[in-house]
Each structure stands twice: as structure tokens, then as C-alpha cells.
Interface confidence: low
């Protein structure tokens, strides 16, 4: 039996700059029941506070609801592990909520096969920003990637589209079925997970519609 090992704050992420969650990896428990507490202070403030909500985001986590989330201050966060033999504290993590945003994936992905006048076929991929994202006001500046592959292929082909919410993919093989996904990333934030997969077959004999 021994004091607990040093916990490590794994990451903090916010879906929308309005709330955020931090997760930690416990160290060894020293073979004893061990309690974990997350405490934080804010840049320029002397007070230290305990995690407001240990439940919402699951085990070894702390959820900061709107009431506890500020984008104007840096949070200095630590996790403390305590058992009857002693205690240990994680290295502090400095968090600016603006920089930990991991949004939901883009929505409303649509795929359409189109043809130019020279009979060249292309896939027109369109999508919308995630619901929570207030892109119009500049609160978020979102960048996007799409990835696609034919059903037979092992590797995804990735295209960075910048701020565009549409992309044209040329040089696809007729008769092949293609899978497409999108993801997004705000300024200085993290990529969302890849969104729902959509598929489309490129026709062999595409006839131009008026």
C-alpha cells in the first residue's frame, strides 16, 4: 500500500466555447480507495474553486457548464489524488476555452453528380456548418476537410477546402461507389470527428439534364 500516483490531465475540450470538459488519467491508486478532486483558479484571480460537476461527462472528468465557463480568462487546472497514505497532484494545465474547441461535425452533407458542357463529370459535395456554430457573426471561423474513397480502396483521399462549404471532385471512375465524409475545425481549435458517411455511385452513362 502506498500514496496514489500522480494523475495527469488528459485533455480539455469545448464543443462551442460555452461549456467545456476536462478529463484526467488517474495514476496508480496505491492499492487503496483513492479520491480525485479537480481544482482551478483563473488568471489574475486569487480564489481556487473545486470542479462544479463530476458527473455529466463521465468518470475522471469535470464538466464546466455555461455558468462556470468564461472565454475571457485562462483557467489553471490541477487534479489532486488522495488516499489514506498520502496525496499527489497533477502538473497544472493552462486552458483558454477559445483554443480547446472541438466542434460537432458539419451537417447536411449532400452529394450530387454533375456534368460540365464538355461532358466532364464531377462530384459536387456540399455541407453546412455544425448547428451550434455561429459562423455568420465571426464568433467562429471554421475550416473544413472532406475525405472520400471508392468502396474498394483502403486509403482515404483528403481535400482541405478552407472556409468553403462545398467542393468539386473531378477524375472519379464511372461505375464506382464513393464514400464521403466531412469534418471541421475552428480557428486554433481541434478537428471535429468525421461526420456521418454518405455514399454515391458515379453512373457509367451520365446524360446531361437540361
Amino acid at each position: 500500500q502506498s500514496p496514489p500516483g500522480k494523475p495527469e490531465i488528459h485533455k480539455c475540450r469545448s464543443p462551442d466555447k460555452e461549456t467545456f470538459t476536462c478529463w484526467w488519467n488517474p495514476g496508480s491508486d496505491g492499492g487503496l480507495p483513492t479520491n480525485y478532486s479537480l481544482t482551478y483558479s483563473k488568471e489574475g484571480e486569487k480564489n481556487t474553486y473545486e470542479c462544479p460537476d463530476y458527473k455529466t461527462s463521465g468518470p475522471n472528468s469535470c464538466f464546466f457548464s455555461k455558468q462556470y465557463t468564461s472565454i475571457w480568462k485562462i483557467y489553471i487546472i490541477t487534479v489532486n489524488a488522495t488516499n489514506e497514505m498520502g496525496s499527489s497532484t497533477s502538473d497544472p494545465l493552462y486552458v483558454d476555452v477559445t483554443y480547446i474547441v472541438e466542434p460537432e461535425p458539419p451537417r447536411n452533407l449532400t452529394l450530387e453528380v454533375k456534368q460540365l458542357k464538355d461532358k466532364k463529370t464531377y462530384l459536387w459535395v456540399k455541407w453546412l456548418p455544425p448547428t451550434i456554430t455561429d459562423v455568420k457573426t465571426g464568433w467562429f471561423t471554421m475550416e473544413y476537410e472532406i475525405r472520400l474513397k471508392s468502396e474498394e480502396a483502403d486509403e482515404w483521399e483528403i481535400h482541405f477546402t478552407g472556409h468553403q462549404t462545398q467542393f468539386k471532385v473531378f477524375d472519379l471512375y464511372p461505375g464506382q461507389k464513393y464514400l464521403v465524409q466531412t469534418r471541421c475545425k475552428p480557428d486554433h481549435g481541434y478537428w471535429s470527428r468525421w461526420g456521418q458517411e454518405k455514399s454515391i455511385e458515379i453512373p457509367n452513362d451520365f446524360t446531361l439534364k437540361d
Epitope: I9, I74, D91, T98, Y99, W139, Y190, W191
Partner: antibody, heavy 118, light 112 residues
Framework: EVQLVQSGAEVKKPGSSVKVSCKAS????????IHWVRQAPGQGLEWMGE????????NYNQKFKGRVTITADKSTSTAYMELSSLRSEDTAVYYC???????????WGQGTLVTVSS | DIVMTQTPLSLSVTPGQPASISCRSS???????????LHWYLQKPGQSPQLLIY???NRFSGVPDRFSGSGSGTDFTLKISRVEAEDVGVYYC?????????FGGGTKVEIK
């Protein structure tokens, strides 16, 4: 104590490549971005790019795009900066720097002098 | 790219006297989130740069309170209330609101 220890000085021929390493210790490597900044002799500082070691996501200064590649090896807590197609103007001290939390540089390596000369 | 212009280029100061360095950016450094990512670094002779001030006016840990930062938008100032011998070196302002991050040309501070 946070430490960034860089590889030693290099002398390279024009047209070749150089790869500088930056070994981090004293903190959780995946929690903070690593940046690369260079300083030509007697000149100011120039930001080259950054990497998030947790997922190897990178941003580059477009000036170096295509010539610079920044990578990170989580298993050894080491970041790398490779610069290709070297020219004499690339002679500089190259620094790695760790962000305070994201994008200002609280901790710096000791610098690596790269000399490009025929 | 954002151009950061520092003045003066060099400064010779008597110990105990104040010093002031100005930094002007070619565009506003106010991020869409409302924060201003303007920072100050000092590079002492033969050393790597060190962080003094982040986000306009926040002193980094261990930085003496004789250093202060102020400003908004495009105009910023670093003040040293009483210059000491250990303050010699080149001071750089830097912005990280816009990619690529950029630095000013530097201001060399010497002791008279």
C-alpha cells in the same frame, strides 16, 4: 522543470535538407503545442510553424510551405523540424518553443545553428 | 501577413530610469473572441528569447513587476519603470491573433 533540448549545430550544402530535433521533458508532451522560430544572424525572429503533438495537426507559415515539415514523436516526446531545398538565406539559429497554453512561447530550446554554405 | 513595427530601434537608459518601447501592428490584433494576442519577449545577449508579457498586459511568472504592458487595437507599449543592468538585450513584440504569427524587428536596450 520544463526543458526543451535541441540537437547540435549543422553545416549543410545548398539544395540539401536539415532535420532539427527538440526533446521535451518536465511536462506532458501532448498537452502543449510546439512551435519553430528562426533567427538569421543579427536579425529578428521569424515564426515557421507549429504542431499539436496530441494529433500531429500542423499550421505553417506560408512562406515556408512546401519546404518545411514539422513532426512529433509522442513515444520519445520529441518534435522535429525539417527544412528542404536549403539556400544560404536559411543560415540561422532555429529554436523550438513550447506554448504557454497555445500560442505564445513560454519555454524555448537553446537553439540550433544551421549554416548553409557551399 | 501582419507587420509589427517597433520604435525606437535602440534605447540607451541610465539605471533606475524608466524606458518605453512602442509596437504598432498593420491590422487590429483583436481576435474574433475579443482577446488581443500581443506579447513581449526579451532576448538577452547570447540567450534564447524569454516571455515577459502575454495578452498585452499579463506578466509571465517570475517577471519582475517593473515590466508592464498596455495598449489596444493596433498600438501597444512596453514600459520598464526602473531599468536595471540585467534588463539589457533586444525586446520583441509579437502577435498571435493572425496566422502566420509575426514579430517586430526588435528594440535594443543598453545601459548608459
Amino acid at each position: 522543470e520544463v526543458q526543451l533540448v535541441q540537437s547540435g549545430a549543422e553545416v549543410k550544402k545548398p539544395g540539401s535538407s536539415v532535420k532539427v530535433s527538440c526533446k521535451a521533458s518536465g511536462y506532458t508532451f501532448t498537452s502543449y503545442w510546439i512551435h519553430w522560430v528562426r533567427q538569421a544572424p543579427g536579425q529578428g525572429l521569424e515564426w515557421m510553424g507549429e504542431i499539436d503533438p496530441s494529433d500531429s495537426y500542423t499550421n505553417y507559415n506560408q512562406k515556408f510551405k512546401g519546404r518545411v515539415t514539422i513532426t512529433a514523436d509522442k513515444s520519445t516526446s520529441t518534435a522535429y523540424m525539417e527544412l528542404s531545398s536549403l539556400r544560404s538565406e536559411d543560415t540561422a539559429v532555429y529554436y523550438c518553443a513550447r506554448s504557454f497554453f497555445t500560442n505564445w512561447f513560454a519555454y524555448w530550446g537553446q537553439g540550433t545553428l544551421v549554416t548553409v554554405s557551399s | 501577413d501582419i507587420v509589427m513595427t517597433q520604435t525606437p530601434l535602440s534605447l540607451s537608459v541610465t539605471p533606475g530610469q524608466p524606458a518605453s518601447i512602442s509596437c504598432r501592428s498593420s491590422q487590429s490584433l483583436v481576435h474574433s473572441n475579443g482577446n488581443t494576442y500581443l506579447h513581449w519577449y526579451l532576448q538577452k545577449p547570447g540567450q534564447s528569447p524569454q516571455l515577459l508579457i502575454y495578452k498585452v498586459s499579463n506578466r509571465f511568472s517570475g517577471v519582475p513587476d517593473r515590466f508592464s504592458g498596455s495598449g489596444s487595437g493596433t498600438d501597444f507599449t512596453l514600459k520598464i519603470s526602473r531599468v536595471e543592468a540585467e534588463d539589457v538585450g533586444v525586446y520583441y513584440c509579437s502577435q498571435s491573433t493572425h496566422v502566420p504569427f509575426t514579430f517586430g524587428g526588435g528594440t535594443k536596450v543598453e545601459i548608459k
